[in-house]
């Protein structure tokens, strides 16, 4: 996990200044309005069942 | 140091109901999705309840097998977690850990709290 | 609701050997991004410990020896080199859908 300024976050992960480390690009899935999913691709919508279960 | 810690477990006969409670610690717990997990020797670990966040109208979700017979609920301003179980049955003895997670995993869990439903 | 069998049930594994465990989903938990997969480690007398989540990615502290694999139903956690302290049983978790559940769990003994 690095600080803002020095090697960017690990391929399938980005920065997040509100949690102060680096997430998984995968989680915003579930977290979709996190501050660190601005700089992953745009995720894939959730299954029908996890957002409405 | 992160920390959570069940309480309420014990004795209970069949039908009986129970209150568990956990305290969370060393995170942000209002930025944590909660969730109850069961282990015993008959099914292992199985996920029971999840709770999400003020931002999520605190959205709930259930196993099938607990759907309407427990209730989970969080208090931010205390960093606690609740599960009220009613009509308990044997085959809800096991140890009930409470756990978080930032999204869809388990980042942390406590040392759980043993149910036995036995007459 | 998805089905996660673990296999072997056990295995025991000499000190610094690679150790291998496999969990196979009865459906897809992957979409052509990111497999929603997790593994945990239970020491006896402990609660499960977050190991690897998202199929691939190691949680903050976990040691590099384990690592994980896999996409769509077939995923599999490795140890190498195994430390004495890995002896432990390892469960994998989905997260595709709700209800999430979890493998049947796979003992692991050091020799």
């Known amino acids: 996990e690095q600080a803002p300024g020095t090697a960017p976050c690990s391929r399938g992960s980005s920065w997040s200044a509100d949690l102060d480390k680096c997430m998984d690009c995968a989680s915003c899935r579930a977290r979709p309005h996190s501050d660190f999913c601005l700089g992953c691709a745009a995720a894939p919508p959730a299954p029908f069942r996890l957002l409405w279960p | 140091e992160v920390k959570l810690e069940e309480s309420g477990g014990g004795l209970v006969q069949p039908g009986g109901s129970m209150k568990l409670s956990c305290v969370a610690s060393g995170f942000t717990f209002n930025n944590y999705w909660m969730s109850w997990v069961r282990q015993s020797p008959e099914k292992g670990l199985e996920w029971l309840a999840e709770?999400?966040?003020?931002?999520?109208?605190?959205?709930?979700h259930y196993a099938e097998s607990v759907k309407g017979k427990f209730t989970i609920s969080r208090d931010d301003s205390k960093s606690r977690l609740y599960l009220q179980m009613n009509n308990l049955r044997a085959e809800n003895t096991g140890i009930y850990y409470c756990?978080?997670?930032?999204?869809?995993?388990?980042?942390?869990w406590g040392q759980g709290t043993t149910l036995t439903v036995s007459s | 609701d998805i089905v996660l069998t673990q296999s072997p049930a056990s295995l025991t594994v000499s000190l610094g050997q690679r150790a291998t465990i496999s969990c196979r989903a009865s459906q897809s938990v992957s979409t052509s991004s990111y497999s929603y997969m997790q593994w945990y480690q239970q020491r006896p007398g402990q609660p499960p410990k977050l190991l690897i989540k998202y199929a691939t990615n190691l949680d903050s502290g976990v040691p590099a020896r384990f690592s994980g694999s896999g996409s769509g139903t077939d995923f599999t956690l490795n140890i190498h080199p195994v430390e004495e302290e890995d002896a432990a049983t390892y469960y994998c978790q989905h997260s595709w859908e709700i209800p999430y559940t979890f493998g049947g769990g796979t003992k692991l003994e050091i020799k």
């Open positions: 709770i999400r966040l003020k931002s999520d109208n605190y959205a709930t």
């Open positions: 756990t978080g997670g930032f999204a869809d995993y388990f980042d942390y």
